[in-house]
Interface confidence: medium
Amino acid sequence: RSRPSFHPLSDELVNYVNKRNTTWQAGHNFYNVDMSYLKRLCGTFLGGPKPPQRVMFTEDLKLPASFDAREQWPQCPTIKEIRDQGSCGSCWAFGAVEAISDRICIHTNAHVSVEVSAEDLLTCCGSMCGDGCNGGYPAEAWNFWTRKGLVSGGLYESHVGCRPYSIPPCEHHVNGSRPPCTGEGDTPKCSKICEPGYSPTYKQDKHYGYNSYSVSNSEKDIMAEIYKNGPVEGAFSVYSDFLLYKSGVYQHVTGEMMGGHAIRILGWGVENGTPYWLVANSWNTDWGDNGFFKILRGQDHCGIESEVVAGIPRTD
């Protein structure tokens, strides 16, 4: 039987998912938004270039049944943070800088806690990373970090760091104070100068990666990578039912393919017998479970285990 066709944000789709008695609950995260905006949120080009895999020996590593990087490294505040990519297909950059921020803190034993700038990566990586707000390649984002480095930069108008994000969060809901979410907007310009009043200089503020690599699509290898080195960037195919995620362990039920989406994977566990990855999204805290979601683990669901990339910070 073919699956019924629903408008991506309709009550009918919410009801359909919830009546299926699946492992997750649907609800409304977006009300007042264009379809072009929703498609643009999914700004990751899947199946792009992959860096070499890092050789890992996981046989002797005792992996726990559940793991949450927020609890493992409580002294690293970025692990708990949810960002907002705004009206821009910059998820490929957000997944990278979020995981990089976490790893810098983890690998320096919290001596360096910095919000790495999504703006710097989005605007300065250029065509090597893809097409800015129109989508990009996660692997190339990590490669840019090792070659050119990334400066610090917090959320929109936070005045945190050298280059905070310049694209405002947009309003997912009917009555709200933020600008409406649209599918338009150019990629901001690459500016190699920190915002006024920030010291040190742009080049001085660069944080570099020592290396970057693919993680194999083995569930155990991904778990070992997170357990040993911190959160990773992953990417998967988003269907319209995912937009409605509220709680539980997401697995695709119905809906049209929206595009590729990059995220940060920070842990795993089992909920009511269903194994999951714990994931941070970049659609603000009013989406999903306070900005986070869980997705089926171990079956390469929607390709979640096929595009995992990571890297080690330089700490010298």
Epitope: I193, Q204, K206
Partner: antibody, heavy 119, light 112 residues
Framework: QVQLQQSGAELVRSGASIKLSCTAS????????MHWVKQRPEQGLEWIGW????????EYAPKFRGKATMTADTSSKTAYLQLSSLTSEDTAVYYC????????????WGQGTSVTVSS | DIVMTQTPLTLSVTIGQPASISCKSS???????????LNWLLQRPGQSPKRLIY???KLDSGVPDRFTGSGSGTDFTLKISRVEAEDLGVYYC?????????FGGGTKLEIK
């Protein structure tokens, strides 16, 4: 061989302007900030400012705003310092200093240019 | 502006003996990225300055390991384990954490 070659000594009249040059060899100035530092006779060092030759961004110490203007030409790998409305207070040796930040820190100094302002 | 205060003004040392120069800043030089932008320079007589140490304690290439930089926050020290004749000159500390960058007044090392 890496070096910064600065222009020769200058004797200028009070009220005049002067433009000093600093030419790099053996490295690409686009990867560096070019700083300028002032040293008055028998005194310490004062930071004037920096220019990023890659994009022309500049930062001046407040004391030197209006007095100093930094420019750079990447094709000739040369940085310039222009000093205007010269007075005896501007009599000093001026050094250019190329600094690369990050994990491959480098720091090169020119030999200095002596500027004497006469009334 | 950040004031950098160096002591002593002059230091007379016998060759082969240790030497220590202190530099105090009027505000902490520890930056939010965990780095301390404190450099030490040496200006030999009649020459341009040369950087010896950057980021508090990292030695520039070619600088002998008898030089060490240490300290944290507002108090910094440059130590020379065994002074050699080529070490004479004026030593400056300089901070790059706060704008504008500022230098210490200098410490003249002379050989006894």
């Amino acid at each position: 061989q890496v070096q910064l070659q600065q222009s020769g000594a200058e004797l200028v009249r009070s009220g005049a302007s002067i433009k000093l040059s600093c030419t790099a060899s053996g490295f690409n100035i686009k990867d560096y900030y070019m700083h300028w530092v002032k040293q008055r006779p028998e005194q310490g060092l004062e930071w004037i400012g920096w220019i990023d030759p890659e994009n022309g961004d500049t930062e001046y110490a407040p004391k030197f705003r209006g007095k100093a203007t930094m420019t750079a030409d990447t094709s000739s790998k040369t940085a310039y310092l222009q000093l205007s409305s010269l007075t005896s207070e501007d009599t000093a040796v001026y050094y250019c200093n190329a600094r690369r930040h990050g994990y491959y820190e480098m720091d090169y100094w020119g030999q200095g240019t002596s500027v004497t302002v006469s009334s | 502006d950040i004031v950098m205060t160096q002591t002593p003004l002059t230091l007379s040392v016998t060759i082969g003996q240790p030497a220590s120069i202190s530099c105090k800043s009027s505000q902490s030089l520890l930056y939010s990225n965990g780095k301390t932008y404190l450099n030490w320079l040496l200006q030999r007589p009649g020459q341009s300055p040369k950087r010896l140490i950057y980021l508090l304690s990292k030695l520039d290439s070619g600088v002998p390991d008898r030089f060490t930089g240490s300290g944290s926050g507002t108090d910094f020290t440059l130590k020379i384990s065994r002074v050699e004749a080529e070490d004479l000159g004026v030593y400056y500390c300089v901070q790059g954490t706060h704008f504008p960058y500022t230098f210490g007044g200098g410490t003249k090392l002379e050989i006894k």
